[in-house]
């Protein structure tokens, strides 16, 4: 007959390494009589016999975890007791080993240049995986701007254009390596104008090309504004190369204007814009007339029919293909602008414009246009249209353009010949002579220039009837 024997654990439990989803087995060999009752604990909590995740065999001496999970990590103990002496216990650790796994992979990112970008890469694994990053085909080197955080995420301070590209994170431990999918880091750059349009001073009827170059990511679009409104005429040519957009606005110049190039690109729901402006001013019409070729002919148009002297010969500029049609179209455009001016100014301005665009002509061997006399020009500017003229000059200085006289091909009075110097060298405006006889009072006007610049012009107030200084007879 066997003697009772207290349990002795002959094979103590050892640390077991197991991979997730694999089988892990603890063996607890016990010698005793009578046969012991063996129970198992995990982290001091009893493992129930009916728990289907475990298999307990060989009279309880073999504990098998059928499919290891990362949560099975812990201290496993077997306790043997047969009522003889005390219960005995042996414990061992289960270390769940895990190939690297990327639990939060990076995603595509669009970021504006200069901001901070963070590409996430959260990993699991045992041993803890080390995380590195690849950009394109090369390992990414950390520097003062680029760092891999403890969490595995990639942080880029002050993002630059050259940071754009394809990235992936790599998680590595002794059991293997995991790669994330390739993600794209797109660096967006606010629209910026590289080359602003240049201002031009040209003669009437010239072609001018305004050029504006802009850069940005995405490539900006360029639009043109003329005097605060969308450009109504001219042709726009665009080309894009290496994220640079080049826009050329070709204009046929019939009026001065402020042209603004606006470069715009979109960043999510927001837009960035950059602007640059140039002015196109019209060189002295009479000067361009002198320098240009042309011919003398009777005016046969409609717009200036009531203003110009009957049967007078006027100068037509052959820098236009159809000079008579072209000059008529110019005056027609100017006429529409005059709708905005006062009833006092309008007829005087019409007289000035018609005689300026259709200058009296001396046939001769070389047809020569005859400009308006300075005194008549100043009368329109300083008396009839003083308010409009001052408003126009103020707006021009501030770069503001609205409807009214600023778009008109008005002469620069100071550059015109004086009738007092040579009465035959310039043209008088009969309308103003008529008004001189019929109008007795004028509103007070402060001269926009010192009176020294204005021959025969009173300093502040003027009345044709009263002031002989404004002599036009």
């Amino acid at each position: 007959e066997k003697l009772p024997k207290a349990p002795v654990i002959t094979t103590p439990l050892e640390t077991v390494d197991a991979l997730v989803e694999e089988v892990a087995t603890f063996m607890c060999a016990v010698e005793s009589y009578p046969q012991p009752e063996i129970s198992w604990t995990r982290n001091k909590i009893l493992i129930k016999l009916f728990d289907t995740r475990y298999s307990i065999r060989e009279n309880g001496q073999l504990l098998t975890i059928l499919s290891v999970e990362d949560s099975d990590d812990g201290i496993y103990c077997c306790i043997a007791n047969n009522g003889v002496g005390g219960a005995v216990e042996s414990c061992g650790a289960l270390q769940v080993k895990m190939k690297p796994k990327i639990t939060r992979p990076p995603i595509n990112v669009k970021i504006i240049e200069g901001l901070k970008a963070v590409l996430p890469c959260t990993t699991m694994g045992n041993p803890k995986p080390s995380v590195s990053w690849i950009k394109g085909d090369n390992a990414l080197r950390e520097n003062s701007r680029i760092a891999v955080l403890e969490s595995g995420s990639l942080r880029i301070h002050n993002v630059q254009k050259e940071d754009a590209g394809q990235y992936r994170c790599v998680a590595k431990n002794s059991l293997g390596t995991a790669y994330s999918k390739l993600v794209k880091l797109e660096v967006e750059v606010f629209a910026r104008i590289l080359r602003a349009p240049e201002s031009h001073n040209v003669t009437f009827g010239s072609f001018v090309t305004l050029r504006c170059t802009a850069i940005g990511i995405p490539v900006p679009t360029i639009s043109w504004i003329e005097n605060g409104n969308a450009v109504s005429s001219g042709s726009i040519q665009e080309s894009v190369k290496d994220r640079v957009i080049d826009s050329r606005l070709q204009l046929f110049i019939t009026k001065p204007g402020l042209y603004t190039c606006i470069a715009t690109n979109k960043h999510g729901e927001k837009f960035s814009t950059a602007k640059a402006a140039a002015t196109v001013s019209i060189a002295e019409w009479s000067k361009s007339q002198k320098d240009s070729q042309g011919y003398c002919a009777q005016y046969r148009g409609e717009v200036c029919d009531a203003v110009l002297a009957k049967d007078a010969l006027v100068f037509f500029n052959t820098s236009y293909r159809d000079p008579e049609d072209a000059q008529e179209l110019l005056i027609h455009t100017a006429w529409n602008e005059l709708k905005a001016v006062s009833p006092l100014c309008r007829p005087a301005a019409e007289a000035l414009l018609c005689n300026h665009l259709f200058q009296e002509c001396s046939p001769g061997v070389v047809p020569t246009p005859m400009p308006i006399c300075r005194e008549y020009c100043l009368a329109v500017k300083e008396l009839f249209c003083a308010k409009e003229w001052q408003a126009m000059e103020g707006k021009a200085h501030r770069g503001l353009y609205r409807s009214g006289m600023h778009l008109l091909p008005v002469p620069e009075c100071s550059k015109l010949p004086s009738m007092h110097r040579d009465p035959t060298a310039c043209t008088r405006l009969p309308y103003l002579d008529y008004k001189k006889e019929n109008i007795t009072t004028f509103p007070s006007i402060t001269s926009s220039r010192p009176s020294a610049d204005i021959p025969n012009l009173p300093a502040s107030t003027s009345s044709f009837a009263v002031s002989p200084a404004y002599s036009m007879t």
Partner: antibody, heavy 119, light 112 residues
């Protein structure tokens, strides 16, 4: 937007007459020189006639002189081509075209109207 | 009358390749004002002609920059630096120097 719309084309017998119209919009009609240009089926373009804006001057291709008359009504923004003594060789699509007084180019064209002269 | 002569009359081109059309006038189109009164027009299939180039070398509004015009006096060239499928049609040169305004015979550009 500049628009030119021709009308009045159709089938006519040799020796017959037809009047084409061109309705214009979107620009200062009275300030532009207007032209008629035609294109015989499968052939190239042939200038027919022009009428100026301000001067009322006009001209014709030799092939239509004395038979065709160009006119305009600035109040109605309309251009016309009266075609008399029509011949087989006048069969063509007739286009109305606006001429830029600055550059001389035909910068806007209508869609055309087909004139067929046949017995 | 000024006679305009275009060559070639037919021009098969592979998309992306350049194309060049020549236009010769029987007398100089250079006006005393310094401008060459030579225009280029394109007539796409089933459409009206449209202005491409005016005064010899100026692109009209909305014309892509792959089109360019050059030349002076009696010899002019229209170049397309990279032909696209939408460029097919008949190209005409026209002199606007004097009446009667005259056109070239036309060059038919087609895609190979």
């Amino acid at each position: 937007e500049v628009q030119l719309v021709e009308s009045g084309g159709g089938l006519v017998q040799p020796g017959g007459s037809l009047r084409l119209s061109c309705a214009a919009s979107g620009f200062t009609f009275s300030s532009y020189r207007l032209n008629w240009v035609r294109q015989a089926p499968g052939k190239g373009l042939e200038w027919v006639s022009y009428i100026s804006s301000s001067t009322g001057s006009l001209d014709y291709a030799d092939s239509v002189k004395g038979r065709f008359t160009i006119s305009r009504d600035n109040a109605k923004n309309s251009l016309y081509l009266q075609m008399n003594s029509l011949r087989d060789e006048d069969t063509a699509v007739y286009y109305c075209a606006r001429r830029s007084p600055y550059t001389g180019s035909l910068d806007n064209w209508g869609q055309g109207t087909l004139v067929t002269v046949s017995s | 009358d000024i006679v305009m002569t275009q060559s070639p009359l037919s021009l098969p081109v592979t998309p992306g390749e350049p194309a060049s059309i020549s236009c010769r006038s029987s007398q100089s189109l250079l006006h005393s004002n310094g401008y060459n009164y030579l225009d280029w027009y394109l007539q796409k299939p089933g459409q009206s002609p449209q202005l491409l180039i005016y005064l010899g070398s100026n692109r009209a509004s909305g014309v892509p920059d792959r089109f360019s015009g050059s030349g002076s006096g009696t010899d002019f060239t229209l170049k397309i630096n990279r032909v696209e499928a939408e460029d097919v049609g008949v190209y005409y040169c026209m002199q606007a120097l004097q009446t009667p305004y005259t056109f070239g015979q036309g060059t038919k550009l087609e895609i190979k």
